[in-house]
Amino acid sequence: LKGQEFAPSHQQVYAPLRADGDKPRAHLTVVRQTPTQHLKNQFPALHWEHELGLAFTKNRMNYTNKFLLIPESGDYFVYSQVTFRGMTSECSEIRQAGRPNKPDSITVVITKVTDSYPEPTQLLMGTKSVCEVGSNWFQPIYLGAMFSLQEGDKLMVNVSDISLVDYTKEDKTFFGAFLL
Amino acid sequence: LKGQEFAPSHQQVYAPLRADGDKPRAHLTVVRQTPTQHLKNQFPALHWEHELGLAFTKNRMNYTNKFLLIPESGDYFVYSQVTFRGMTSECSEIRQAGRPNKPDSITVVITKVTDSYPEPTQLLMGTKSVCEVGSNWFQPIYLGAMFSLQEGDKLMVNVSDISLVDYTKEDKTFFGAFLL
Amino acid sequence: LKGQEFAPSHQQVYAPLRADGDKPRAHLTVVRQTPTQHLKNQFPALHWEHELGLAFTKNRMNYTNKFLLIPESGDYFVYSQVTFRGMTSECSEIRQAGRPNKPDSITVVITKVTDSYPEPTQLLMGTKSVCEVGSNWFQPIYLGAMFSLQEGDKLMVNVSDISLVDYTKEDKTFFGAFLL
């Protein structure tokens, strides 16, 4: 009798369970970017450290060639911060010269690439006008949200201007994802 | 026969499982900071509310003396927002006086302290130049990412200038972590 | 003997377990806002896309009339980003005209409404002074944190000025929550 009571609830509750510790996860950190050919009208992608310091990939979440590879379908939390730094922005130089105020901007995009789909999908975008009057400016853009991803999807981080990315510290610029 | 088929898969799948509801979690909220001796060349740490209002700690995640104590090893999502506020920044005053533009800045760092390791580790940093021209400025810095932490690790939030932290509302300045 | 050893640990470990895949989750994305009557002294709430594109609700997490409905009690991670955009802010216009510097501001609030409680609770606030000197400015405010929510709670996103919200892209302005 005990066995009969137990069996159905066991089957009902535990079938799709899995240990949290074996879920795909990655936290990637910034490195100095190497010069690459950027496609016209397309923001360049950052490449990342995946092993040293705070960086890691685990449980079949792999990093290769600027992409995080999604090893199994499910809902993932995906995040990135990019810290930008520059000199006085064009906007204030132009303003001082009495010409129209065209603000510079900085943009971060987390992009999903699906091989079976021709166009990349922009999952997250953080974009900010920069019209600083100090001689040096620096600021982060942070992004994070949950997405339903498919096995084989690839994630990358694109930025509007790779030359402005602060690559000096692993805690300033980073990229990560984990299966919920 | 059925029993024989069942046993191995049971052992294989369920061994490391644990209930989500008993995972270590904390959300801490801002309080007015009390005067403490600040170490030169080291950003001061904030202290926090851990019980009242929206704040809580649970499942052996404890808060003591500005630190969140990590009660078990694993991958944690760690986050904080600090809202800063001030009056016209020095940068714009200097600019008006025709002297070189030295921007002020605001910085938040989430730091890990491991007793067995002499130097704290900076997990996350958000840093921003402030060169505001209005009479009052205010802005948040948000940080969040996943880290592999060890039992006994301690987390704190350090800021570049404790005197500019907005302590007025629990939803403006906060700090949290949860085991994934 | 084997059975006797097995039973207690089974009862001890697995009782409150549940499959990750059936947890309430939602990611909502921006749509053009329809004009509504705003209550005086109360920030207007945004309404959202919940099905098309990147947006989804699942596992009894429902969206209705600007609210995310919490279907079961537990700890949730709640997040939102709102991208604002505008012309030169009032602050810089006033400054140019030689009047006192009153900066504009932009604010995002994630609010919890509990039917049994008369006053809404502000869970998260991101507020930023805007004193831009370029002719066009745009910037995001990101928020995210963990909260203990009760079945029946409702979440919404309020903004200081609905007319400044960038509704042009689903990746720029979004709102989500998931049970941990």
């Epitope: - | 005067p35 403490t36 009056m87 009052n136 404790i162 005197s163 | -």
Partner: antibody, heavy 120, light 107 residues
């Protein structure tokens, strides 16, 4: 016990300068923001300036911006207010007051005040 | 700047009276308000902070209440030592600003 003692007040002609001092004792001076607040004869209280505990942030009322400079010497437990280009409307009793850690907060201790009279 | 308006500007009362002073802010300041007492020729003294918290050493006959834009200082039973001028001050946003004062005098 906490003590704040102002000095340096006096009579000065318009356009001239004056430097006020505030000697602090009975607390850890270097841990608190410090303020100057003034009160014109027969009038109410007006906040003048604040300096953060470490001296890194200094904010001023619009009425004195560009003319007054607040500073502190934590090794001497002393707060200063350098007042330049003085005007008749700067005539007041000047109080130094202790704030909290945040530079925007209440004032829990006040000095006895020092009178500054700007007159030709 | 946030304007703080106190009323009345002068109040005549007798020892033992219950006295209420009102302070209004031109915009919401949550609970970030302090009350001070000042006697002629003396420095102000902190009575109440955070709208309702009694400063250490201040008699319990003083109490503060309110939030948002409307605040009150109440003296439950006026004592001879309480005849003075009272000021409210907001510290919700820069710059900190004071009310014009309320003088409590002997009737």
């Amino acid at each position: 016990q906490v003590q704040l003692v102002e000095s340096g007040g006096g009579v000065v002609q318009p356009g001239r300068s004056l430097r006020l001092s505030c000697a602090a004792s009975g607390f850890t001076f270097s841990s608190y923001a410090m303020h100057w607040v003034r009160q014109a004869p027969g009038k109410g209280l007006e906040w003048v300036a604040v300096i953060s505990y470490d001296g890194s942030n200094k904010y001023y009322a619009d009425s004195v911006k560009g003319r007054f400079t607040i500073s502190r010497d934590n090794s001497k437990n002393t707060l200063y207010l350098q007042m330049n280009s003085l005007r008749a409307e700067d005539t007041a009793v000047y109080y130094c007051a202790r704030g909290q850690v945040a530079i925007l907060d209440y004032f829990d201790y006040w000095g006895q005040g020092t009178l500054v009279t700007v007159s030709s | 700047d946030i304007q703080m308006t106190q009323s009345p500007s002068t109040l005549s009362a007798s020892v033992g009276d219950r006295v209420t002073i009102t302070c209004r802010a031109s915009q919401s300041i949550s609970s970030w308000l302090a009350w001070y007492q000042q006697k002629p020729g003396k420095a102000p003294k902190l009575l109440i902070y955070d709208a309702s918290s009694l400063e250490s050493g201040v008699p319990s006959r003083f109490s503060g209440s309110g939030s948002g834009t409307e605040f009150t200082l109440t003296i439950s039973s006026l004592q001879p030592d309480d005849f003075a001028t009272y000021y409210c001050q907001q510290y919700n946003s820069y710059p900190p600003t004071f009310g014009g004062g309320t003088k409590v005098e002997i009737k």
